[in-house]
């Protein structure tokens, strides 16, 4: 049940056929077409920052670039939620926030982005190569998950405190800006295609010198495609993964919040066209998890963040559920 919109490979013309200008006019429509095709695909961005003031203090910011309303956000570390990751915070748009050590402060930044500050000390504190994941659920369309970690070069002790990247307002600037560019692009594309129809097409011959342009793969944002878009998340260095938060269980017996199933098999689906996503900040990794379900369902609109619930000292622990990796 997965359909892909295949953007045909475009052979560059032989030099001299139409010159650089002609080449540009031919390539641009395809680039714009890719943008138009992928424009409706919801995506998630993640930014991980180490604070310069506290060496092992992290700030994780995540945002949802889709149009649907968010029903729940789950932030985990050590891998995706349910695939061995440990839940740090769960944010509900109306009912507040639950967080577990070492999470210090989780909050909504906008209706579609959140931030989480992690404590820097203690046995369960994160380190530079920890992977952090954010999962945005939009019921009943499905969920999208992205993971990120600090780039190896990050050295907050030497560099100035990182400045918040423009992507932090991607939900506003990105959606408005990208939508505007895409709208213009799509109109321009139609204009180009109409002009192209009224004149004889130049003969395109395979170039002997230049290799074939890689085939761009775009995912059509139609409900029919229901494409599950997978980008393998960053590899986790287990030496740095915290001991699961079982150590924080002072009371015996199972924790009420102790188990998360894996919500789908992680099957890489090949390269995706990310043209519609603003480039994330340094130290980010963007991916779209399973559950791409483009058509919006009917849900009451959510209000802003509500009350904050106090964290359960026992903390959650991820467990493999029956929807595990096959």
């Amino acid at each position: 049940m997965r359909t892909e919109a295949q953007v045909p490979a475009l052979q560059p013309p032989e030099p001299g056929l139409e010159g650089a200008m002609g080449h540009r006019t031919l390539v641009l429509p395809w680039v714009l077409l890719t943008l138009c095709v992928t424009a409706g695909t919801p995506e998630v961005w993640v930014q991980v920052r180490m604070e310069a003031t506290e060496l092992s203090s992290f700030t994780i910011r995540c945002g949802f670039l889709g149009s649907g309303s968010i029903s729940l956000v789950t932030v985990s570390w050590g891998g995706p939620n349910g695939a061995g990751g440990t839940t740090l915070a769960v944010l509900h748009p109306e009912r507040g926030i639950r967080q577990w050590a070492p999470a210090r402060q989780a909050r909504w930044e906008t209706q579609s982005s959140i931030s989480l500050i992690l404590e820097g000390s203690g046995a369960s504190s994160p380190c530079a190569n920890t992977t952090f994941c954010c999962k945005f659920a939009s019921f009943p369309e499905g969920s999208w998950e992205a993971c990120g970690s600090l780039p190896p070069s990050s050295d907050p002790g030497l560099s100035a405190p990182p400045t918040p990247a423009p992507i932090l307002r991607a939900d506003l600037a990105g959606i408005l800006g990208v939508s505007g560019v895409l709208l213009f692009g799509c109109v321009y594309l139609l204009h180009l295609l109409r002009r192209h129809k009224h004149r004889p097409a130049p003969r395109l011959q395979p170039s002997r010198t230049s290799p074939q342009a890689p085939r761009a793969r775009a995912w059509a944002p139609s409900q029919a495609s229901q494409a599950a878009l997978h980008v393998p998340y960053a590899t986790i260095n287990t030496s740095c993964r915290p001991a699961t938060l079982d150590t924080a269980h002072p009371h015996g017996g199972p924790s009420w919040w102790a188990s998360l199933p894996t919500h789908a098999a992680h099957r890489p689906q090949g390269p995706a066209a990310w043209a519609s996503t603003p480039i994330p900040a340094r130290g980010s990794f963007v991916s779209v998890e399973n559950g791409l379900y483009a058509q919006a369902g009917e849900r009451p609109p959510h209000t802003g963040p509500g009350l904050t619930l106090f964290p359960d000292p026992r903390g959650p622990r991820a467990m493999e559920g029956p929807l595990g990796v096959r």
Partner: antibody
């Protein structure tokens, strides 16, 4: 391995109410939910409603609205379903199931309790 | 009367392939995921297929799901006697604002 263990069979009089419990063991719900699904003898499955224990949010099927109450008790890792104004047609096996509506945005049930038979008879 | 329509029964011989259909509308299958459950006699239902065509770990690849428009189907190939059970399709219904099930299909292995 997550297990949902439900309370025992009940025999109730018409007009009364019944409360069925569902205790999670071997790990539990976190951002997941608990739904209640019933099955009348020889009939199909019928969804009654759902709770996200972490936030206490509930969602009920239109048919049961006002007659069913779903709750959860965090310290004991237990979810409850109370059905009032019982009628003979409420005789059924009542299942609790872990759902993924909140966490994964999907109305899917991946773990089920063993079921509780509720008989409504005068 | 169930919101999703399934044939009451299907049958097949061991090794054969059978298909169970599930018909809905634009407010459920037409716009939302389809799930399939298997209920062996005297037991609780078990998740068989999720998100239209995905199989949970532990479910044999003899079971496959598909969806087209407002209909879905479950295919069981290489039938075995242990496949004899009731099969239910399910989806979210935007109009009813709830989970809906099919009436169930009894699969008999002859």
């Amino acid at each position: 391995q997550v297990q949902l263990v439900q309370s025992g069979a009940e025999v109730k009089k018409p007009g009364s109410s019944v409360k069925v419990s569902c205790k999670a063991s071997g790990g539990t719900f976190n951002n997941y939910g608990i739904s209640w699904v019933r099955q009348a003898p020889g009939k199909g499955l019928e969804w009654m409603g759902q709770i996200i224990p972490l936030f206490g949010t509930t969602k009920y099927a239109q048919k049961f609205q006002g007659r069913v109450t779903i709750a959860a008790d965090e310290p004991t890792s237990t979810a409850y379903m109370e059905l009032g104004s019982l009628r003979s047609e409420d005789t059924a096996i009542y299942y609790c199931a872990r759902d993924r509506m909140a966490a994964d945005g999907m109305a899917v049930f991946d773990y089920w309790g063993q079921g509780t038979l509720v008989t409504v008879s005068s | 009367q169930s919101v999703l329509t399934q044939p009451p029964s299907v049958s097949g011989t061991p090794g054969q392939k059978v298909i169970i259909s599930c018909s809905g509308s634009s407010s459920n299958i037409g716009r939302h995921f389809v799930f399939w459950y298997q209920q062996l006699p005297g037991t609780a239902p078990k998740l068989l297929i999720y998100k239209n065509d995905e199989r949970p770990s532990g479910v044999p690849d003899r079971f496959s799901g598909s969806k087209s428009g407002t209909s879905a189907s479950l295919a069981v190939s290489g039938l075995r006697s242990e496949d004899e059970a009731d099969y239910y399709c399910s989806s979210w219904d935007a109009a009813l604002n709830g989970v809906v099930f099919g009436g169930g299909t009894k699969l008999t292995v002859l």
